[in-house]
């Protein structure tokens, strides 16, 4: 599956939380970023993530004029020059500093099996999704479309009124 344009079709800032309303937070430790899944105290500020949406052509045999068969890919950046990456060997989700063009590991196919939540499928390992495991983000294998509704791969995006990207 190939990205059809080098520019995102849209971008926006949102805070990311689990289906159970735990927040995804990012902390700089020893010159690298760690990702946590945690309950925030009341009025504690949520971390923001810049979501960039790209169109991608799905590799299919569908007939037609190319209008059909597109999907949305996203990259997620909580801070300048850092993006979430899928480490398929370690089944982990990591924050890495990257330059554009971003590697395929930084792209995730967007799904939403509920109207108010989304899931992120690894571009480099189809059927594997960002999920929550032991209070951390991990890559989780999903066997069938029925399991796309399992709560540990569902995330909520809540809008933010801050338009800067720290």
């Amino acid at each position: 599956m190939s990205i059809t344009g080098i520019s995102p079709i849209t971008e926006y800032l949102a805070s990311l939380s689990t289906y159970n309303d735990q927040s995804i937070t990012f902390a700089l430790e020893d010159e690298s970023y760690e990702i946590y899944v945690e309950d925030l105290k009341k009025d504690e500020k949520k971390d923001k993530v810049l979501l960039s949406y790209y169109e991608s052509q799905h590799p299919s045999n569908e007939s037609g004029d190319g209008v059909d068969g597109k999907m949305l890919m996203v990259t997620l950046s909580p801070t300048k020059d850092f993006w979430l990456h899928a480490n398929n060997k370690e089944h982990s989700v990591e924050l890495h500093k990257s330059e554009k063009p971003l590697p395929d590991q930084a792209f995730f196919v967007l799904h939403n099996m509920h109207s108010n939540s989304v899931s992120f499928e690894s571009k480099t390992d189809p059927g594997v999704f960002i999920g929550v495991k032991d209070n951390h983000l991990a890559l989780i294998k999903v066997d069938s479309s029925e399991n796309l509704s399992t709560e540990n791969i569902l995330f909520k995006l809540s809008e933010t009124h801050h338009h800067h990207h720290h």
């Epitope: 849209t10 299919s60 597109k70 967007l110």
Partner: antibody, heavy 121, light 106 residues
Amino acid sequence: EVQLVETGGGLVQPGRSLKLSCKTSGFTFSSYWMYWIRQAPGKGLEWVSSITPNGGNTYYPDSVKGRFTISRDNAENTIYLQMSSLRSEDTATYFCAKGHYYYTSYSLGYWGQGSLVTVSS
Amino acid sequence: DIQMTQSPSVLSASVGDRVTLSCKASHNINKHLDWYQQKVGEAPKLLIYFTNNLQTGIPSRFSGSGSGTDYTLTISSLQPEDVATYFCFQYNSGWTFGQGTKVEIK
């Protein structure tokens, strides 16, 4: 070529039921959200229902909740709208539409030509 | 629920005019907004998605812009074939259409 063809419309008495079908072709049906949208004569568009690609989740506005049921048959590439307890205000052309992208509920990429439902005694 | 309000309800302009249609959301919809064109007796057709992306096959005289709660569809040079009703549609939270703007030729 993407095609969506609605059938099943017609004249029905208030309080009765009717089932619409939308047969599709030309795309990987099981990967797309599908929708029903209606338009009363001379009026605007109203979203009526949505269904996820695997059929596991369905959504309705309050105006039809509890009376209308959307479903899909991924083997037959068809969606359905079962309408019960019909009211005169349900009189409209009913369009089916497919999502613009695989897997997501964003944008209505293609529409059928519509099927007219008239609720009158 | 998010409400979408379009203005004006009817717009009358001359061929070649630059035409601007407005759509206002009751809450921030994060650019999750489309524009649809519906000609008399036809099904609606997707023109613009995600606020400013032109659907394949749509003439470049159509463009979209906006953010937050305020969105605009612009026709840079109105043509006779653009006579139609235009609907905005949000999908940020649930799904809601605006009531439509009817575009006529003077």
